[in-house]
């Protein structure tokens, strides 16, 4: 039961995490205008991975896509790539893990195959989560660097009475969504890997016991499941005799636009 719960929970946590990674990737608020220096601005700027937006105090919001590929900073391209890789790996992981779930019976799929698939999906979730966390962290680092650069340049080069306040950007909501989502996907992946260990049938090495019946010399070897060595299904290991000693899990498995800062 504990293994099924761990696997199920790992799947759900990963599902939420990947949904969060997708949401973060699509969100426009990766960086938002820092209002500390100009809290009275009537125009609010924010930027995403795919477009930049301006919300006027009237409520009117205008967004412009980054219609150039070569003109964008390499770091932004890298973040996009990391997030997309994270989504793709996560999606494949989800697909694999659905078939690996113990509560879902597909044909005569053996536990060893399910364990194999659970481990595969778990690794995919871990890599997916790491990609998202890395992508968000790279973007955050880029923001911090640009923030201090623009702070240093804020009032330089302007003589006289005129002030030119350079727009500075700080962390947007998408960064926090991305970090949390990446973390959840990572945790879900770890849980899947832990569940995989419980799913893999263990080698049961029973000692051969010789029973000497009067007049006969018969050696009876209890076999139970002749366990395969791990994750590949071994077709030679036929079920000879069900020894009755099963885990709770086995009993419970029923069928069921531009400038970029």
């Amino acid at each position: 039961m504990a293994v099924t719960a761990c696997q199920g929970l790992g799947f759900v946590v990963s599902l939420i995490g990947i949904a969060g990674i997708i949401a973060a990737t699509c969100m426009d608020q990766w960086s938002t205008q820092d209002l500390y220096n100009n809290p009275v601005t009537a125009v609010f700027n924010y930027q995403g991975l795919w477009r930049s937006c301006v919300r006027e105090s009237s409520g009117f919001t205008e967004c412009r896509g980054y219609f150039t590929l070569l003109g964008l900073p390499a770091m932004l391209q890298a973040v996009r790539a990391l997030m997309i890789v994270g989504i793709v790996l996560g999606a494949i992981g989800l697909l694999v893990s659905i078939f690996a779930l113990k509560c879902i019976r597909i044909g005569s799929m053996e536990d060893s195959a399910k364990a194999n698939m659970t481990l595969t999906s778990g690794i995919m979730f871990i890599v997916s989560g790491l990609c998202a966390i890395a992508g968000v962290s790279v973007f955050a680092n880029m923001l911090v660097t640009n923030f201090w650069m623009s702070t240093a340049n804020m009032y330089t080069g302007m003589g006289g009475m005129v002030q030119t306040v350079q727009t500075r950007y700080t962390f947007g909501a998408a960064l926090f969504v991305g970090w949390v989502a990446g973390g959840l996907t990572l945790i879900g992946g770890v849980m899947m890997c832990i569940a995989c260990r419980g799913l893999a049938p263990e080698e049961t090495n029973y000692k051969a016991v010789s029973y000497h019946a009067s007049g006969h010399s018969v050696a009876y070897k209890p076999g139970g499941f002749k366990a395969s060595t791990g994750f590949g299904s071994n077709t030679k290991n036929k079920k000879i005799y069900d020894g009755g000693a099963r885990t709770e899990d086995e009993v419970q498995s029923y069928p069921s636009k531009h400038d970029y800062v």
Epitope: A42, V43, S52, V54, S57, S58, G59, V165
Partner: antibody
């Protein structure tokens, strides 16, 4: 068509209060910010503040924060501005103006209400 | 608060003339996010409410004749009337639309010569 009809002229004594109204028609009242602007005799325009009828959220010019109170009545599509502790320098024409959607600028203005403060 | 300074304060011209008036702001009204200048021009005739002419420094409001044009960026802006018509004699105000409180210039009064 869009119309903003303001209440009639008011004559008040110093220290009194006055509540000006601006009735909107011809558009969805709750979708646009309503601005209030003051113009003293022979002077320029001064922005008092604005209110969003849907949320009741306001933004005041610091200069008028203790002078003006902006409110709305969604049921009658009417915006109000109450001016308190009136003084002779509050004698002016007060305009309400609808927020322009697509730009920050108001695009429809009321005809104005003249407030005279005299002892 | 952003200070808006208009010049000249009054201007005499004849019908058919090309007229230019300027507006200076104490801070840049250029928004880096969309490269738009948040400056608006209004026309006001005696006893009437102001009328929106131009927003975003150069975008003409619908229904405004093409003889009115706005230009400039950052802190320096210009309103040009290419060929004055009798109905254009009025007071023109520029307004900061970038930062609260929204501030107006002192106005330029356009009179008949």
């Amino acid at each position: 068509q869009v119309q903003l009809v303001q209440s009639g002229a008011e004559v008040k004594k110093p220290g009194a209060s006055v509540k000006l109204s601006c009735k909107a028609s011809g558009y969805t009242f709750t979708s646009y910010w309503m601005h209030w602007v003051r113009q003293r005799p022979g002077q320029g325009l001064e922005w008092i503040g604005m209110i969003h009828p849907n949320s009741g959220s306001t933004n005041y010019n610091e200069k008028f924060k203790s002078k003006a109170t902006l409110t709305v009545d969604k049921s009658t599509s009417t915006a109000y501005m109450e001016l308190s502790s009136l003084r002779s320098e509050d004698t002016a024409v007060y305009y309400c103006a609808r927020r322009y959607y697509g730009s920050i600028s108001p695009d429809y203005w009321g005809q104005g209400t003249t407030v005279t403060v005299s002892s | 608060d952003i200070q808006m300074t208009q010049s000249p304060s009054s201007l005499s011209a004849s019908v058919g003339d090309r007229v230019t008036m300027t507006c200076k702001s104490s801070q840049s009204l250029l928004n880096s996010g969309n490269q738009k200048n948040y400056l608006t021009w209004y026309q006001q005739k005696p006893g009437k409410a102001p009328k929106l002419l131009i927003y975003w420094a150069s975008t003409r409001e619908s229904g405004v004749p093409s003889r009115f044009s706005g230009s400039g960026s950052g802190t320096d802006f210009t309103l040009t009337i290419s060929s004055l018509q009798p109905e254009d004699f009025a007071t023109y105000y520029c307004q900061n639309d970038y930062s609260y409180p929204f501030t107006f210039g002192g106005g330029t009064k356009l009179e008949i010569k």
